[in-house]
Interface confidence: medium
């Protein structure tokens, strides 16, 4: 084994080197000392280091550590947060273009219900949209609810146009009707199926990629534990006490201290590979009545089939709604 | 409900579908987000190896620090006399992970289940059903013209997916790219201290 | 460091306009939904408005629905609000404040980072 | 919308003692309640999220617990940079609402 070489016997090289550290160059010994008080660069002979240029290295060695760990992750986090903006974004734009293509439907085919159905088309959509953002709302009675609204438009403007306005207080009854008779058939059950899929999917994808952001952030802020920076200041820096600045540590020594230091983060890993992994599998499934941009660019179409429905069986419908809500003053169907 | 998004409605333009033709759907940036995290599946269990050679390490030099003294590269020493007498490093292992990484790797439990439940063959069932039940449309296969509606006027046929992603303008600026904003950027004097 | 500069307030008449700006920097704006917060003098925080990282979307209280406008300016690092037919109620301090996500709800209106507050006064 | 009432408006104590501030929703929030302190002249600054999570650099004296529609923050030992207005705040529901704050003061 080679002898180590002579410290510097003045400690110059060690000084000037400090003083980028901490300006100012009180701590720095003149001269090599015995080096009795140090805890962590233990001295084998005279040594250039005091406990206060120790107590420095390991700050500096921890804040070295977090750079490290920050500029790792860089390329990871960007990633994510790059594409989970974009994806709310799309999802955000999607919903915006249902939504016009719903209210073109009316105006172009239904313009008499304008514009109460722009309204109950609104505010449907705006559900959509918060239910995306992760507000607790029921899709069922996001469906209902657009349903519920339309009908008494659809039965006092489409199917019983000369209705007198006396007769305009039977909303609560017709809202009712619309359940109990099926006015809408099977639509209104179809409808909530793909609507419930895909934004339940649309949902638990951009909360995964959020959570991707959060466990990178997690992992990034870490604080080294005590025991991690000692063993990383004598990697890194117990070498310029002995004046041996150019000195680079063994490959095999620093793999055994990263992997000491960094033992809580590894266990992450399990579940991170199972992340991604997962992560592929919902994206591959995300297709038809599980892609939302299919499903709500669709939307517009199958409430016009459902109100293509009511007006097919209008006469019947009429007829028993006629004598269902003629007395809904007395009795409130609902 | 009161509280809802300033009114988009964008009238008669809508019918024409005058989105930009652009090769990325939805589903495709999706598939190619998963194929770029792909490659960082590794990424924690690789986080030890990539800090070291992203630290000095002695490459080429016959001689490399192993905590206490000089030795060769590639003698036992190496590795081993520098944990010697300092502190148990097996001891370190035993600690357990931070109490914030035992939180993050709980919720990364949680969507995991969550994502293979939501994955599910089981789960798609209905799609059968509602072939059964008549609700597809009959006149429209699963071609690249997918119909959007059936009869009536102002129908409108839209190309397969609507390609809007060109609106939005997710290609990075140079403020946000890695580097610029991104960048922990501590005091001069307190970091990049390695001495090379 | 992340920082929101706000700028903007003032005295104005009741019916009057104004239009606050907030510069955001040290961190990627155009990745994370905005939020306007305004609090009233000697009372408690409101939220105002809210819009998404590419500003396809924006939502507001009640309170302004009609009055005010959220805007973005991806390429500036900037967020706008602007305020029309100001009325006396409208007076406050406003902050605007980045949308976060932690994992769980999955919606946006968690507000991480704040501007230093604008105030904003409206009196005849 | 959801609203929230905290309890006390005021809470009047001596560094080092503990502070138990309370946090009421009128209908069930899950865990998505979030805690801010805010200082004199000052922008708020988020403290916990979901009910009990700790936000980046808030030291531990500060915890938060609950769920459902009671939720409380505790400050283990005052020190004397935590005399502040706390303000909570609900994300479960549309529109985000604030509680009416409660202001922690030297006794």
């Known amino acids: 084994q080679p002898p180590p070489p002579p410290p510097d016997a003045t400690c110059h090289q060690v000084r000037s080197f400090f003083q980028r550290l901490q300006p100012g160059l009180k701590w720095v010994p003149e001269t090599p000392v015995p080096g009795s008080d140090l805890q962590v660069c233990l001295p084998k002979g005279p040594t250039c280091c005091s406990r206060k240029m120790e107590e420095k290295y390991q700050l500096t060695a921890r804040l070295n550590m977090e750079q490290l760990l920050q500029s790792a992750s860089m390329e990871l986090k960007f990633l994510i947060i790059q594409n989970a903006a974009v994806f709310q974004e799309a999802f955000e734009i999607v919903v915006r273009h249902a939504k016009n293509y719903t209210n073109a439907m009316f105006k172009n085919n239904y313009p008499s219900l304008t514009p109460q159905a722009f309204e109950f088309v609104g505010e449907f959509f705006t559900d959509v949209s918060l239910y995306i953002l992760g507000s607790d709302i029921n899709v069922d009675d996001m469906v209902n609810e657009l349903f519920d609204s339309l009908f008494p438009v659809i039965y006092t403007q489409l199917m019983n146009p000369g209705l007198p306005d006396s007769a305009l207080d039977i909303n609560e009854c017709l809202r009712g009707a619309r359940r109990d008779l099926k006015v809408f058939g099977n639509f209104p059950k179809l409808i909530m199926t793909q609507v419930s899929k895909s934004l339940q999917v649309t949902r638990i994808f951009l909360q995964a990629l959020n959570l991707g952001i959060e466990v990178i952030n997690t992992t990034d802020h870490l604080k080294f534990s005590k025991d991690c920076g000692r063993m990383l200041t004598r990697m890194w820096y117990c070498s310029y006490c002995q004046g041996l600045m150019m000195v680079k540590p063994c490959g095999g020594y620093c793999n055994v201290v990263m992997q000491g230091c960094m033992a809580g983060v590894v266990e992450i890993d399990k579940y991170w590979r199972e992340y991604i992994l997962s992560l592929e599998e919902l994206v591959n499934g995300m297709y038809r009545i599980y892609d939302m941009e299919n499903v709500l660019l669709g939307l517009f179409s199958t409430i016009h089939d459902s109100i293509q429905y009511v007006q097919k069986n209008a006469g019947k419908l009429t007829t028993t709604i006629g004598k269902l809500c003629a007395h809904s003053q007395q009795r409130q169907y609902r | 409900s009161a509280y809802y998004p300033e009114d988009l409605f964008i009238d008669k333009k809508v019918l024409k579908v005058a989105h930009v033709e652009h090769e990325e759907t939805l589903s495709s940036r999706r598939r190619e987000l998963i194929q770029k995290l792909k490659s960082f599946i590794s990424f924690y269990s690789a986080l030890p190896g990539y800090i070291c050679s992203h630290s000095p390490v002695a490459e080429n030099d016959t001689l490399c620090w192993n905590g206490q003294e000089l030795v060769e590269r590639y003698s036992q020493k190496a590795a081993r006399n520098g944990m010697k007498n300092q502190f148990n490093l097996h001891e370190l292992k035993m600690k357990g992970p931070e109490p914030v990484v035992s939180q993050i790797i709980d919720k990364l439990k949680h969507i995991n289940q969550l994502l293979r439940t939501m994955s599910m063959p089981k789960g798609r069932v209905l799609d059968k059903n509602l072939d059964e039940e008549g609700f597809e449309s009959g006149d429209c296969g699963d071609d690249e013209d997918e119909c959007i509606g059936g009869s009536g006027d102002g129908m409108i046929k839209v190309k397969n997916q609507l390609r809007f992603l060109a609106e939005l303008a997710y290609d990075l600026d140079v403020d946000d790219a890695p580097g610029n904003s991104q960048q922990a950027t501590p005091k001069d004097n307190e970091i990049s201290t390695f001495h090379n | 460091q992340m920082q929101l500069v706000q700028s903007g307030g003032g005295l104005v008449q009741p019916g009057g306009s104004l239009r606050l700006s907030c510069a955001a920097s040290?961190?990627?704006?155009?990745?994370?939904?905005m939020n306007w917060v305004r609090q009233a003098p000697g009372k408690g925080l409101e939220w105002v408005s809210y819009i998404t990282s590419g500003g396809s979307s924006r939502y507001y209280a009640d309170s302004v629905k009609g009055r005010f406008t959220i805007s973005r300016d991806n390429a500036k690092n900037s967020l706008y609000l602007q305020m029309n037919s100001l009325r006396d109620e409208d007076t406050a301090v406003y902050y605007c404040?980045?949308?976060?996500?932690?994992?769980?709800?999955?919606?946006?209106?968690?507000?991480?980072?704040w501007g230093q507050g604008t105030m904003v006064t409206v009196s005849s | 919308e959801i609203v929230l009432t905290q309890s006390p408006a005021t809470l009047s104590l001596s560094p080092g003692e503990r502070a138990t501030l309370s946090c009421r929703a009128s209908?069930?929030?899950?865990?998505?309640l979030a805690w801010y302190q805010q200082k004199p002249g000052q922008a708020p600054r988020l403290l916990i999220y979901d009910a009990s999570n700790r936000a980046t650099g808030i030291p531990a004296r500060f915890s938060g617990s609950g769920s459902g529609t009671d939720f409380t923050l505790t400050i283990s030992s005052l020190e004397p940079e935590d005399f502040a207005v706390y303000y909570c705040q609900q994300r479960s529901n549309w529109p985000p609402t604030f509680g009416q704050g409660t202001k922690v003061e030297i006794k």
């Open positions: 209908q069930s929030v899950s865990s998505y």
């Open positions: 404040a980045r949308g976060t996500y932690y994992y769980g709800s999955g919606n946006y209106f968690l507000f991480d980072h």
């Open positions: 040290g961190f990627s704006f155009s990745s994370y939904a």
